[in-house]
């Protein structure tokens, strides 16, 4: 996209801090104005930006789903960190849902690792 001097629909609220872009980019915690002349701060707890950017708006903070707990709340420079509730875990294959951890191992196997928010219990065969 090429700029060749933007929107009452989306003017910054008076309390939002403003500064000038550096080489066309705004620092983490800010987004650029539509005329590319100002950096406008993100709204704490509502949106964020993690890198130097030329976004027209900050990114919306994630809201933790039911079945998740908030480990870190959203700041202007970091998104919310959500974690599966105790007794559930998030699989790499389906990261959008927390699955229940198994309660025990099958017959002939023993538990070597407990359930964590990132992994199910781990079972290995009993040594004979």
């Amino acid at each position: 996209i090429t700029r060749q001097s933007l929107d009452p629909q989306r003017r910054a609220a008076p309390q939002q801090k403003r500064s000038s872009p550096t080489e066309g980019l705004c620092p983490p915690g800010h987004h650029i104005s539509e005329d590319s002349r100002e950096c406008i701060s993100c709204k704490y707890g509502q949106d964020y930006s993690t890198h130097w950017n030329d976004f027209l708006f900050c990114l919306r903070c994630t809201k933790c789903d039911s079945g998740e707990v908030e480990v870190n709340s959203c700041t202007t420079t970091r998104n919310t960190v959500c974690q599966c509730e105790e007794g559930t875990f998030r699989e790499e294959d389906s990261p959008e849902i927390c699955r229940k951890c198994r309660t025990g191992c099958p017959r002939g196997m023993v538990k070597v690792k407990d359930c964590t928010p990132w992994s199910d219990i781990e079972c290995v065969h009993k040594e004979s």
Partner: antibody, heavy 117, light 110 residues
Amino acid sequence: QSVEESGGRLVTPGTPLTLTCTVSGFSLSNYAMSWVRQAPGKGLEWIGIISSSGTTYYASWAKGRFTISKTSTTVDLKVTSPTTEDTATYFCARETYYGYSYAAGLWGPGTLVTVSS
Amino acid sequence: ALVMTQTPSSVSAAVGGTVTINCQASQNIYSNLAWFQQKPGQPPKLLIYETSKLASGVPSRFSGSGSGTEFTLTISDLECDDAATYYCQSSWHSISTDCAFGGGTEVVVK
């Protein structure tokens, strides 16, 4: 609320052409406006956008080939030096800001430009 | 420049069926994706904005998902009136990123 394009016609290659998008029922000081084109039987191609305050941005391929400007009720698209590849229906569309996204929600019916010698 | 790759280019399904259209961005566009429906001789119609939000008056049979570079439009309980060409577009979100469209997907309803 409506938008309507006009100015499409048959032109010879190299003859500058200006298309006009006339809006009613809303103010251009509150909305950004995009121009999009569609060659016969082909897909949509974004040309550029003019913000509510008049800043213009163009697609990488469109730089230098088009100029967007506006008055209080119209948005113009100037095709600086048309080639046969610019034969297309040209649409203008109003961009609505939804809080964390823009989208072209209101479109005109389009105006056909034919470039031929 | 940003490139939006849409697949398939054409898909056919029966009334009452489900159609899935994929859109891939050549760079991270976060959730800034819109879907449009276009019928012959008409301008495009906005269906979905911000990846998954339904535009006003659009039936809930249309749904969108994805983020980053991979996006999907799903049309369920297909109706004859859904026969059209569908386009994805990277919506305006960055000073340096084009608002590119995908190549389009023709949906044929049998």
